[in-house]
Interface confidence: low
Amino acid sequence: HNTTVFQGVAGQSLQVSCPYDSMKHWGRRKAWCRQLGEKGPCQRVVSTHNLWLLSFLRRWNGSTAITDDTLGGTLTITLRNLQPHDAGLYQCQSLHGSEADTLRKVLVEVLADPLDHRDAGDLWFPGESESFEDAHVEHSISRPSQGSHLPSCLSKEPLGRRNPLPTHFHPSPPGLHLSHQDSSSQRPLGCSLAWTEARDTSTQ
């Protein structure tokens, strides 16, 4: 499994999505776990409803929620009030008996609130020391709309000036395409931007 990077702004919500084959994982509950070290165990954070058919009901553990669209084949994890200590390596898992299949490996990166006007060097709290050069990157940046009917990320302000990115990312990375994910019903605070690396060939 390649690692998919999700970036969120400190203090706001980050949504992580894990697509999967709904037929292959029919009847299976799902879980979100945090990887403890490179080769350590994956510590369960939250799992879907005990009754698989009720997996669409959102379950919370502290500030982390999980919901599963078992027919659409999308597991969604919400990290509310994102903090620097939330940065790290996670997994979306499909459970069967005492076994767990990895649906997606996720690296969560926490960006400083852009409204703090810090230097670019302060914007990234890396979760892991390893480099993920082949990672599939999804910037899921949500922020409150600034007194406008449009979320601020849909404003006409140049992308490079308004998206807080880690310093090792170019504001508009070559080879990436920008797409708006319409999920306003799940992200009342703002919006999400997904940057999908064109050369990524990871399989779920």
Epitope: S22, G27, D69, T70, G72
Partner: antibody, heavy 119, light 108 residues
Framework: QVQLVQSGAEVKKPGASVKVSCKAS????????MSWVRQAPGQGLEWMGV????????VYAQKFQGRVTMTRDTSISTAYMELSRLRSEDTAVYYC????????????WGQGTLVTVSS | DIQMTQSPSSLSASVGDRVTITCRAS??????LAWYQQKPGKAPKLLIY???SLQSGVPSRFSGSGSGTDFTLTISSLQPEDFATYYC??????????FGQGTKVEIK
């Protein structure tokens, strides 16, 4: 008690479409997935697909992809199955069946709707 | 697609007989298997789910066993009302063919 009541028998011409309804009562409609299964005369059971009444999301059997559409109206606790471009081999009894959370297999079935495709 | 193969396709038995029907999956389905009974002109009735769990209201003479690819439905003492067609059904995966072809239990 749980009941799934289906619409009446239909006779259709080849190339036409048919829409079968399944009205649920006696339980919370949005708490269970609804599946559709058909059975040709003298033949076995064939799974067609399943719908989540909450989201409306569906999974269809590969054989029926592009021809079947499953929908629901939660306000009247009714699921629908529409099959288009009918051919004679679609002549069958069509069943809706509820999937409970404790089994994941179909526990309650509708009485069946006979669809006859004939020119 | 996963193929479900039932055997035998039909059998003749007498009241009181012990009857065994087998179902083989073309790949591992864990214990995601159900057994149904169907009588002519009627909708199928769930007997067993999760390979061995007896559905509420089903007589205890029906039992299921197996895991992985090989499964068995057993009727310990056949009753007159048990003459019917029995289907296995896998729901670990959802391809187009998920039911077995059926086993017809007839009176000898």
């Amino acid at each position: 008690q749980v009941q799934l009541v289906q619409s009446g028998a239909e006779v259709k011409k080849p190339g036409a479409s048919v829409k079968v309804s399944c009205k649920a009562s006696g339980y919370t409609f949005t708490g269970y997935h609804m599946s559709w299964v058909r059975q040709a005369p003298g033949q076995g059971l064939e799974w067609m697909g399943v719908i989540n009444p909450v989201s409306g999301n569906t999974v269809y059997a590969q054989k029926f992809q592009g021809r079947v559409t499953m929908t629901r109206d939660t306000s009247i606790s009714t699921a629908y199955m529409e099959l288009s471009r009918l051919r004679s081999e679609d002549t069958a009894v069509y069943y809706c069946a509820r999937i409970p959370s404790y089994t994941y297999a179909f526990d309650y079935w509708g009485q069946g709707t006979l669809v006859t495709v004939s020119s | 697609d996963i193929q479900m193969t039932q055997s035998p396709s039909s059998l003749s038995a007498s009241v009181g007989d012990r009857v065994t029907i087998t179902c083989r999956a073309s790949q591992d389905i864990s214990n995601y298997l159900a057994w149904y009974q169907q009588k002519p002109g009627k909708a199928p009735k769930l007997l067993i789910y999760r390979a061995s769990s007896l559905q509420s209201g089903v007589p205890s003479r029906f039992s299921g066993s197996g895991s992985g690819t090989d499964f068995t439905l057993t009727i310990s003492s056949l009753q007159p009302e048990d003459f019917a067609t029995y289907y296995c059904f896998q729901y670990r995966h959802m391809p187009s063919q998920t039911f077995g072809q059926g086993t017809k239990v007839e009176i000898k």
